[in-house]
């Protein structure tokens, strides 16, 4: 007996569907109608045949009452080849739902997305997360997707993007976007970051995550942020192989005074990088390769400093006296 493709938990809160059969019974997903969190994994299937079975151009208002009744707030769709027309049809219908968070992962979007009809209403998402999603339209995908969303998006996460740079002239501003996560795009680099941070399109960014994005120096990131006019309060540069020293010929970069939290953990640093902001609320330098204690002008003024997991603090290294530089905490680095 093959296992049921969909499983709903006892609280009717979370429903997960794994459609791995070549000819899946999609109607099984109806048991998820009462769930708040829904995950649908299509086992890498090509959903092109679906277009023949549904009328992607039908007026979605006919489903409005039914869709409004759904409890779903968080939806994850993964592992499929999806025609853009089908994606658009789904977005048009979901616009009538109470969906707040949408995650698309391991998807290949084929074809181009049609423009939003005048009478259509956008999807009022607060969070959109994309991981390993490829788009046939190349750099213009964000602009195409954006027109199907209302302007209230607060969180945007784009990981393993095939084209992390956007066609900036086509992208409209994200006035409410406070968190942008471009982590896990190792090919991005500082030049790519400049291209991805479309100037003045992200005016409200407070949290910017750039883990594992091929960043090289904090100063280079500073320059990219300054060029884009992006002034985050919190910046995560962890899991990049960062250089501590600055190219002497490179111009000095003044960090925005808005920045108060900087994560430089797991960055392979052998010394505290030069050119950090003068004052920070939080600085995380844990799990680096600092082999000596910093001297007073090497650290900014920090309220909350994390240094655990650096060689100079590890118990067993010779310290001048007990308690001197040892936090007593040894994190798993």
């Amino acid at each position: 007996t093959t296992p049921e493709p969909c499983e709903l938990d006892d609280e009717d809160f979370r429903c997960v569907c794994n459609f791995s059969e070549p000819q899946p019974d999609w109607s099984e997903a109806f048991q998820c109608v009462s769930a708040v969190e829904v995950e649908i994994h299509a086992g890498g299937l090509n959903l092109e045949p679906f277009l023949k079975r549904v009328d992607a151009d039908a007026d979605p208002r006919q489903y409005a009452d039914t869709v409004k009744a759904l409890r779903v707030r968080r939806l994850t769709v993964g592992a499929a080849q999806v025609p853009a027309q089908l994606l658009v049809g789904a977005l048009r219908v979901l616009a009538y739902s109470r969906l707040k968070e949408l995650t698309l992962e391991d998807l290949k979007i084929t074809g181009t997305m049609p423009p939003l009809p005048l009478e259509a209403t956008g999807l009022a998402l607060s969070s959109l997360r994309l991981r390993n999603v490829s788009w046939a339209t190349g750099r213009s995908w964000l602009a195409e997707l954006q027109q199907w969303l209302k302007p209230g998006l607060k969180v945007l996460s784009i990981a393993q993007a095939h084209s992390p740079a956007f066609s900036c002239e086509q992208v409209r501003a994200f006035p409410a976007l406070t968190s942008l996560d471009l982590s896990d795009n190792p090919g991005l680099g500082e030049r790519g970051l400049m291209a991805a941070l479309c100037p003045h399109k992200f005016p409200a960014i407070q949290n910017l995550a750039l883990r594992n994005t091929g960043m090289e120096t904090p100063t280079g990131v500073c320059a990219a942020l300054a060029a884009a006019g992006v002034q985050p309060h919190s910046l995560d540069l962890s899991h990049n192989s960062l250089r501590a020293t600055v190219n002497p010929s490179a111009p000095r970069c003044m960090w925005s005074s808005a920045l108060n939290s900087l994560n430089l953990s797991f960055a392979g640093l052998e010394q505290v990088p030069k050119g950090l902001p003068a004052k920070l609320r939080v600085l995380d330098l844990s799990c680096n390769r600092l082999n000596r204690a910093p001297q007073p002008d090497e650290l900014p003024e920090v309220d909350n400093l994390t240094l655990d997991g650096n060689p100079f603090l590890v118990p067993g290294t010779a310290l001048p006296h007990e308690g001197s530089m040892n936090s007593g905490v040894v994190p798993a680095c």
Partner: antibody
Framework: QVQLVQSGHEVKQPGASVKVSCKAS????????MNWVKQAPGQGLEWMGW????????TYADDFKQRFVFSMDTSASTAYLQISSLKAEDMAMYYC??????????????????WGQGTMVTVSS | EIVMTQSPATLSVSPGERATLSCKAS??????VDWYQQKPGQAPRLLIY???NRYTGIPARFSGSGSGTEFTLTISSLQSEDFAVYYC??????????FGQGTKVEIK
Amino acid sequence: QVQLVQSGHEVKQPGASVKVSCKASGYSFTDYAMNWVKQAPGQGLEWMGWINTQTGKPTYADDFKQRFVFSMDTSASTAYLQISSLKAEDMAMYYCARSTFYYSSYIYGWYFDFWGQGTMVTVSS
Amino acid sequence: EIVMTQSPATLSVSPGERATLSCKASQNVGSNVDWYQQKPGQAPRLLIYKASNRYTGIPARFSGSGSGTEFTLTISSLQSEDFAVYYCMQSNTNPPWTFGQGTKVEIK
């Protein structure tokens, strides 16, 4: 064991210069910043500033930005304090003191764990 | 610049008695206050670092407390070798650092 040994007492005329040395031993000289502290006769301690022993960059307290120079010789594990155009108010005991870094769950700072024995600089005509 | 004010200027105590020395910072310095002891003709010696941590080899009768702007050094039972001048110093993360003017502990 860690030791900071300073040069001997000096008697100088007003307007002259003096160079006080502080030789470190028992630890890696470049791993710890070196501070200078002044103590005028019968007075309290006054922090003059410090030198980054990695880079050689000095930092001076406001009252010591003129006529005072901190320097170092890494190969000799020695820090120096030079005072030029000596004045009567420069007459004091000068101490070098090593800064050690402290860190414990988010809190950090430095303190002076080892001090030189002091060098008395007398300014007299 | 942060000003450190110590009180009293002189404290007269009998051997075996408790001595309490006060140090006030002109602004919040967290726990970044260290205490030093200086005997005549000697260099200062570190007693307490970061407000309450006793330095290696310092007897348990010395203890430090406080945070923010008010700090205290307590000597629970004065020994003859404890009669000296005591200085607090703020080492608030980044320089400039400043010493208090000192408290002289003398035999009553």
